[in-house]
């Protein structure tokens, strides 16, 4: 198993508008993010 803390946090998921670093890798690679347009199921963290 790869080190889960290897230059990114595995748990930083999904949320559009919050991509700032490699720690947001899940945001960049989520179904929600891939939709690009239309309703996003999970709004950005306020």
């Amino acid at each position: 198993l790869a080190d889960p803390l290897d230059h990114r946090d595995a748990g930083d998921l999904w949320f559009p508008g919050e991509s700032e670093s490699f720690e947001d890798a899940h945001v960049e690679h989520s179904i929600s993010r891939s939709l690009l347009e239309g309703e996003i199921p999970f709004p950005p963290t306020s």
Partner: antibody
């Protein structure tokens, strides 16, 4: 509309193999990271493993207890991911879900019994 | 592994009353970005899990605001302010910070 549809579940004998398919639609597939998660008869959810996308060289991660028996793969042209399960054990009996952790499929039942 | 301990295992609530479910993590779920990687799902009978709360306290779209989440680095709570019949099912906490990803054992919510 986002859809994740799992197929391939069945009743199998211990020691046998089975391959599950998760066919997707409604989103850009190539670089999405997807997971298999299962729900046991005792209603416990267990993460099985993950496959990343093309830009991450399709890296895979597995629950340690399943590594070696289970293999996740994907076919971008088919917009699908797969779970190859070998040397199945009775404790592998569960509903298997394909998920992005945000969207989930309906699940498919795998029963391992002699 | 990060162990998530949920309690109670089951809860019986009168419709209109509040309910509270706890989840304790064996490790801190605070990421290096200051994000707390604790999630709540509801699995209704015969259905797939659906996300209720992400990052400890953020309500997923389409989820009624009677649901709320809070806590610290290791101790978390899901609250339902006024339980409705559609809230019946099994509630799970989950962490997606460290491999392997893990879930709590679940809390079954029933109506009185």
């Amino acid at each position: 509309e986002v859809q994740l549809v799992e197929t391939g579940g069945s009743l199998v004998q211990p020691g046998r193999s089975l391959k599950l398919t998760c066919a997707t639609s409604g989103f850009t597939f190539t670089n999405v990271w997807l997971h298999w998660i299962r729900r046991s008869p005792e209603n416990q959810l267990e993460w099985v493993g993950q496959i990343k996308g093309k830009s991450d060289n399709y890296a895979t991660y597995y629950a340690e207890s399943l590594q070696g028996r289970f293999t996740i793969s994907r076919d971008d042209s088919e917009r699908s991911i797969y779970l190859q399960m070998n040397n199945l054990k009775e404790e592998d009996t569960a509903i298997y879900y394909c998920t992005g952790l945000d969207y989930w499929g309906q699940g498919v039942m795998v029963t391992v019994s002699s | 592994d990060t162990v998530l301990t949920q309690g109670p295992l089951s809860v019986s609530v009168t419709p209109g009353e509040s309910a509270s479910i706890s989840c304790r993590s064996s490790k801190s779920l605070l990421s290096s970005k200051g994000i707390t990687s604790l999630y709540w799902y509801l699995q209704k009978p015969g259905k797939s899990p659906q996300l209720l709360i992400y990052r400890m306290s953020n309500l997923a779209s389409g989820v009624p605001d009677r649901f709320s989440g809070g806590g610290s680095e290791t101790d978390f709570t899901l609250k339902i302010s006024k339980v409705e019949t559609e809230d019946v099912g099994v509630y799970y906490c989950a962490q997606f910070l460290q491999y392997p990803y893990t879930f709590g054992a679940g809390t079954k919510l029933e109506l009185k």
